[in-house]
């Protein structure tokens, strides 16, 4: 009688992660008596995948009833496939022996390849905020995909970026891969509403790439411009001075009025006006009693924005004469303001 052959008809099988892999195997004879076992890999370090008689293999089912008389189909199904299951699987016939069963004949092997989707890209920006004209780095990471081929693109407000570096790890063969990319973005004053997008395309995504986003509002700090102006006299001996704080982001801002270097008033920006570009404007008023001062008064508007060192703008108030209006000669953007009276 012809010697038993173990036939694995499929050289390779491609399965999507989460699905079931069918590994086919048939024997050409019932002799010799002994069990079939499935292994992943060859040699002494091979991993037992299925033993038809003992052991615990909850993910494996047989295609046919192995105990049926004359059964020669030893195909198996492996459920819930993950990238870690990739490898070459061997169907091996054993001959019963003493003390242990003896390997008799192995199939040629079936290579199981697993297609796994990349995880949703996670985009992260710098730990600290940066100001316009500075270059900041954004990173994008995605994991767990297979095969290795993958495409990553960066966009800022729909415009593709070119200044980035991408690595796919590991370099050699692996069950699954990760991608890491770093893009450099130059901030502008208009970036409060901007978005940076990392787009990942992979064969498993069927032309529908995954995107991760980062809002530049989390990254940018637009420092304010200050303008101090003196308003017409409201009443005898009283002068209104305003400090216009323009085009700042984020909103966290504290303003202090100083009269001749002495703190007169401190307040925190609350009711602000939002500009179209996402920055904010705010105005603070100070009512100065001129009669309380013998000499000229130096009024300073000091602003601490988002925990940064304070910036200030001063205005000299002449006590000797009380003109109807007197203002500092500071250039100002043409934006609205929100009045806030301080008495």
């Amino acid at each position: 009688e012809e010697e038993l052959q173990v036939i694995q008809p499929d050289k390779s099988v491609l399965v999507a992660a989460g699905e079931t892999a069918t590994l086919r195997c048939t024997a050409t004879s019932l002799i010799p008596v002994g069990p079939i076992q499935w292994f992943r890999g060859a040699g002494p370090g091979r991993e037992l995948i299925y033993n038809q008689k003992e052991g615990h293999f909850p993910r494996v089912t047989t295609v046919s009833d192995l105990t049926k008389r004359n059964n020669m189909d030893f195909s198996i199904r492996i459920g819930n496939i993950t990238p870690a299951d990739a490898g070459t699987y061997y169907c091996v016939k054993f001959r019963k022996g003493s003390p242990d069963d003896v390997e008799f004949k192995s199939g040629a092997g079936t290579e199981l390849s697993v297609r796994a989707k990349p995880s949703a890209p996670v985009v992260s920006g710098p730990a600290a905020r940066a100001t316009p004209q500075h270059t900041v780095s954004f990173t994008c990471e995605s994991h767990g995909f297979s095969p290795r081929d993958i495409t990553l693109k960066w966009f800022k407000n729909g415009n593709e970026l070119s200044d980035f570096q991408t690595n796919v790890d590991p370099v050699g063969e692996s069950v699954s891969y990760s991608i890491h990319s770093t893009a450099k973005v130059v901030l502008t004053r208009e970036d409060v509403h901007s978005q940076v997008i990392c787009e990942v395309a992979h064969v498993t995504l069927q032309g529908d790439p995954l995107r991760g986003t980062a809002n530049l509002s989390e990254t940018i700090r637009v420092p304010p411009t200050l303008e101090v102006t003196q308003q017409p006299v409201r009443a005898e001996n009283q002068v209104n001075v305003t400090c216009q704080v323009r085009k700042f982001y984020p909103q966290r801002l504290q303003l202090t009025w100083l009269e001749n270097g002495n703190v007169s008033r401190t307040e925190t920006a609350s009711t602000v006006t939002e500009n179209k570009d996402g920055t904010y404007n705010w105005m603070s008023w100070l009512l100065v009693n001129v009669s309380a001062h013998r000499d000229d008064v130096k009024l300073t508007c000091q602003v601490e924005h988002d925990g940064q060192p304070a910036v200030s703008k001063s205005h000299d108030l002449k006590v000797s004469a009380h003109p109807k209006e007197q203002g500092s000669n500071t250039a100002a953007e043409n934006t609205g303001s929100n009045e806030r009276n301080i008495y």
Epitope: E47, K53, G55, T67
Partner: antibody, heavy 113, light 108 residues
Amino acid sequence: EVQLVQSGAEVKKPGATVKISCKVSGFNIKDYYMHWVQQAPGKGLEWIGRIDPEDAETKYAPKFQGRVTITADTSTDTAYMELSSLRSEDTAVYYCDRGLAYWGQGTLVTVSS
Amino acid sequence: EIVLTQSPATLSLSPGERATLSCSASSSVSSSYLYWYQQKPGQAPKLWIYSTSNLASGIPARFSGSGSGTDYTLTISSLEPEDFAVYYCHQWSSYPYTFGQGTKLEIK
């Protein structure tokens, strides 16, 4: 549901023979090796042997070789373990298990004169 | 035959602590054939970890298994009251199949 139900406790005299049964349900007994394991009071687990019910092929641990016989009746889905020439140190709980994954509740065998 | 030696014989710990149980084989055992069982007084052993590192159905994720060759480990990251029991390692790589002598995990 996989179940292995063993026969009740036995008290035997030294030199006697005991035969314990293990009736299975929820699977075909021919599909799996049936193992037997001994556990003496306060001691660990000791593998006795196993049977392939499909062809009655057996393997035994050297310690029990010659005194133990494992059999199976595929028509009733029952495995048996027979231990002869009993001595006091054979006092133990005996477990059957299916392919190393599912275990019977155990049978206490007491050997006492 | 392959002799499995478990250490320590008894491990006294408190709930919330980390437990590390060792199993050393007298000759190499393929990781596919190294199983762990849990046994509580008056009960049959239960399959706990199979093929060195795979948790049997319903076993909490605080349990993990690792090892290769002759050295294997069962780890419990943070002990719960129900984890106190005897744990046995078992090899079925070659006949005769053997068990370790067991590690008793007791409440301190």
